[in-house]
């Protein structure tokens, strides 16, 4: 017991941490002072009635990844204040409703990864009226969802069910919950997907399907009497799909009248872009979908892709598209022209070069586009990039950060409405008249700049941290500046006069520089009370670099001797 006790440390607020130790039981002597108890990753196998008896003020109990196989009936009887209970990844093969009955304050319950076959003989959660987040199920033994399982639950913020190996679903089991903001469903096979879908369509706002093989999925008409679907967002995560089954999935999505957002994360498309509908299939209506997000899409036969034209007509109403880290090197001109409502396009972490971007941003492409993100692609010439985007008349925001431009020409052409340009982490070592005068926000942080002497009359925000600047920029060149972030440069000092010359400046972040703590600098920074309002990272990030005897100390704390300040 004494070694058990030694593995636990508690602070004055009653936050007790004893994770990743060698505890084989809950430490003794726990009192009402304990508010939070984390005993995750230990070797606890048994919880007795007396272990937590005195913990009447306990609000969070984390017991994940132990070897718990037994919990005595009244183990949690005194935990009326408990809000967060995590029993995930233990060896609980039978769940008892008596554990949860006293937990009237519980808002979070995680029972994932325990080897139970069902959620018990009686309704486990019917007394948990405040429950907001519930996680249940496991990867292999949880095979059956019963009608009584979720009885008594009316509203949940999040419900996660690991039904990876589900073999039986009793109709209406999930219908009893009136509203679920976010349902996460792990299912290896799709056999029971439609039955579950029918039950949740009118109660779930955001439906997420994980780890499912949809290669052979076939949609058959739903036996649902009602069509008033609540689902606004459908996410497919780590799902396998083919050309044919994608078409079937779209038929399923057709049933969701109010669907606004569609997301595919870490999915695999085993296809070649053959999305042609068979003759007897009616045309798919994309409904109201406004946002399409695709991240890390894996297409094993990517270079066999040949025809996306059947999907073009489905895209005309989409307003926001993200296709990130999916090896995109070209968006067909015709597709761009069909994206008539598109306002936001994020193609981060792809393979775009200027010459192929030209094909994508062809005449009449993306006519409504306001924001284009091409972060971390294969762009190499600012001049070519700007020129290529001239066709986009409504473009105001461009993020081309994390491309290697190195140099910047003296002049460039850009869409005339440009307001925001992100050139951070592009290896540039100077800024020139290539930067458009219309900008209101410019980000050139994390580059090799040692000078900033551009006149940008409309600029309101300048982000220029992590460069090699030795002084603040000349304020007369930036008459409208509100925000200047210039931390982690090589600035040694700045004066009251310099700051005052930025007439409109509201926010300055200049920490992480090599300040020479002269008497003038210290008196200015320490006497100006108003400075703390402007310097958002003051005082923590303002350290003296010299004189050597005060190096590393906060500027606000440094006091130089009279003799140091009055040398003639």
């Amino acid at each position: 017991e004494s070694s058990n006790q030694a593995s636990l440390s508690c602070d004055r607020n009653g936050i007790c941490k004893g994770s990743s130790g060698s505890l084989n039981s809950i430490p003794s002597g726990l009192t009402e002072a304990v508010k939070s108890l984390d005993l995750s990753n230990n070797r606890i196998t048994y919880i007795s009635n007396s272990d937590l008896q005195r913990c009447v003020n306990l609000q969070a109990l984390v017991l994940t990844s132990n070897g718990i196989n037994t919990i005595e009936e009244d183990s949690f009887s005194s935990l009326g204040s408990l809000e967060h209970l995590d029993l995930s990844y233990n060896y609980l093969s039978n769940l008892s409703s008596s554990w949860f009955k006293p937990l009237s304050s519980l808002t979070f319950l995680n029972l994932l990864g325990n080897p139970y076959k069902t959620l018990g003989e009686t309704s486990l959660f019917s007394h948990l009226t405040k429950l907001q987040i519930l996680r249940v199920g496991n990867m292999d033994t949880f095979t059956k969802i019963q009608r009584k399982d979720f009885a008594g639950l009316t509203f949940l913020e999040e419900l996660e069910i690991d039904a990876s190996d589900l073999q039986s679903y009793e109709p209406k089991s999930l219908k009893s919950i009136q509203n679920v903001s976010h349902l996460i469903l792990h299912m290896k096979q799709h056999i029971l997907l439609l039955e579950i879908f029918v039950d949740v369509t009118s109660s779930v706002e955001c439906l997420e399907l994980r780890d499912t093989d949809l290669d052979t999925f076939h949609f058959s008409e739903l036996s649902t009497g009602e069509t008033n679907s609540l689902i606004k967002k459908f996410t497919f995560r780590n799902v396998k799909i083919t050309d044919e089954s994608l078409f079937q999935v779209m038929k399923l999505l057709n049933q969701i009248s109010g669907l606004l957002e569609l997301e595919f994360d870490d999915c695999t498309l085993n296809g070649v872009g053959n999305f042609r509908a068979s003759d007897n299939d009616r045309v798919i209506d994309p409904g109201k979908v406004e946002t399409l997000t695709i991240r890390r899409l894996h297409i094993p036969r990517f270079y066999l892709f040949y025809d996306l034209s059947t999907l073009y007509s489905l895209t005309e109403r989409v307003k926001r598209i993200t296709v990130e880290n999916s090896k995109v090197f070209l968006v067909p001109c015709l597709l761009s022209q069909h994206l008539k409502s598109l306002e936001y396009l994020d193609l981060s972490e792809n393979l775009m070069v200027e010459e192929y971007l030209k094909n994508s941003a062809c005449e009449d492409a993306w006519p409504s586009l306001q924001t284009l993100i091409l972060r971390q692609n294969h762009l190499a010439s600012l001049e070519k990039t700007g020129e290529t985007l001239l066709t986009l008349k409504n473009l105001t925001n461009i993020d081309i950060s994390k491309n290697s431009f190195h140099s910047m020409p003296e002049t460039c052409q850009w869409p005339e409405k440009m307001k925001y340009l992100n050139l951070s982490s592009t290896r540039i070592h100077s800024v020139t008249g290539c930067i458009p005068k219309t900008l209101e926000i410019l980000d050139v942080s994390n580059n090799n700049l040692n000078l900033f002497s551009l006149n940008l009359p409309q600029l309101k925000e300048l982000y220029i941290s992590r460069n090699k600047l030795m002084t603040l920029p000349d304020a007369s060149l930036l008459p409208m500046l509100l925000v200047l972030k210039i931390s982690r440069n090589a600035i040694t000092t700045f004066s009251k006069e310099q700051l005052d010359s930025f007439h409109t400046l509201k926010t300055l972040e200049a920490g992480g520089n090599n300040f020479i703590c002269s008497c003038e600098f210290l008196s200015f920074t320490q006497e100006q009370q108003a400075l703390a309002k402007v310097l958002i990272d003051w005082p923590a990030n303002y350290l003296c670099d010299s004189p050597s005897h005060v190096r590393g100390q906060q500027v606000q704390d440094v006091r130089l001797s009279v003799s140091e300040c009055h040398r003639t």
Epitope: K327, F329, L330, C333, L351, N359, Q376
Partner: antibody, heavy 118, light 111 residues
Framework: QVQLQQSGPELVNPGASVKLSCKAS????????INWVKQGPGQGLEWIGW????????NFNENFKDKAALTVDTSSSTAYMELHSLTSEDSAVYFC???????????WGQGTTVTVSS | DIELTQSPASLAVSLGQRATISCRAS??????????MQWYQQKPGQPPKLLIF???NVESGVPVRFSGSGSGTDFSLNIHPVEEDDIVMYFC?????????FGGGTKLEIK
């Protein structure tokens, strides 16, 4: 500037394996694909396959599927190609090359000569 | 596999004149309006060097005397005027379908 530095020449016995390296500098290694290309003595170029350091995904020419294994070490910005069960047919110069825009090879290593002989 | 046939296998040209090398693909290398065809130059004992990508885009740093044209299955590399330094080997390469393939090469010679 962008550079791909390949390991030195290899003389190996038939049936043995050899591991060639290609160290990248001057660009963000994880943003580009690395391709490998074979050029037999006095012959043309043959594409072996690629690897994307960001996610480790690979794609091979079927002719090399059982011959070559591609790996990367992102911490040292180095790509590797291991050739197995070598025969005299595998004697060639092997190039690594950076894949840009998903379609073209804009920077090449100097090549590693592999000679298979007993 | 897409087969690329380069012609001629060797081409004798006079310095200052135009050289045209052809590359024919066994099937189209078009990808939504872009031809995924590249041209490389290789000097003896050196790796190939990219000249042209996407059929007609000249790689940065490549002299303007090099140009590429063509679409579908028929492509050509033009060098005008030919200089001494250009009398080397040239390869075409497609990246429309895996496996990517190269042409057999064309050797430029002085007439």
């Amino acid at each position: 500037q962008v550079q791909l530095q390949q390991s030195g020449p290899e003389l190996v016995n038939p049936g043995a394996s050899v591991k060639l390296s290609c160290k990248a500098s001057g660009f963000t290694f994880t943003t580009y694909g690395i391709n490998w290309v074979k050029q037999g003595p006095g012959q043309g170029l043959e594409w072996i396959g690629w690897i994307y350091p960001r996610d480790g995904s690979t794609n091979f020419n079927e002719n090399f599927k059982d011959k070559a294994a591609l790996t990367v070490d992102t911490s040292s910005s180095t790509a590797y190609m291991e050739l197995h069960s070598l025969t005299s047919e595998d004697s060639a110069v092997y190039f690594c090359a950076r894949l840009t825009g998903g379609t073209f090879l804009d920077y090449w290593g100097q090549g590693t000569t592999v000679t298979v002989s007993s | 596999d897409i087969e690329l046939t380069q012609s001629p296998a060797s081409l004798a040209v006079s310095l200052g004149q135009r050289a045209t090398i052809s590359c024919r693909a066994s099937e189209s290398v078009e990808y939504y309006g872009t031809s995924l065809m590249q041209w490389y130059q290789q000097k003896p004992g050196q790796p190939p060097k990219l000249l042209i990508f996407g059929a007609s885009n000249v790689e940065s740093g490549v002299p303007v005397r090099f140009s590429g044209s063509g679409s579908g299955t028929d492509f050509s590399l033009n060098i005008h005027p030919v200089e001494e330094d250009d009398i080397v080997m040239y390869f075409c390469q497609q990246s429309r379908k895996l496996p990517w393939t190269f042409g057999g090469g064309t050797k430029l010679e002085i007439k």
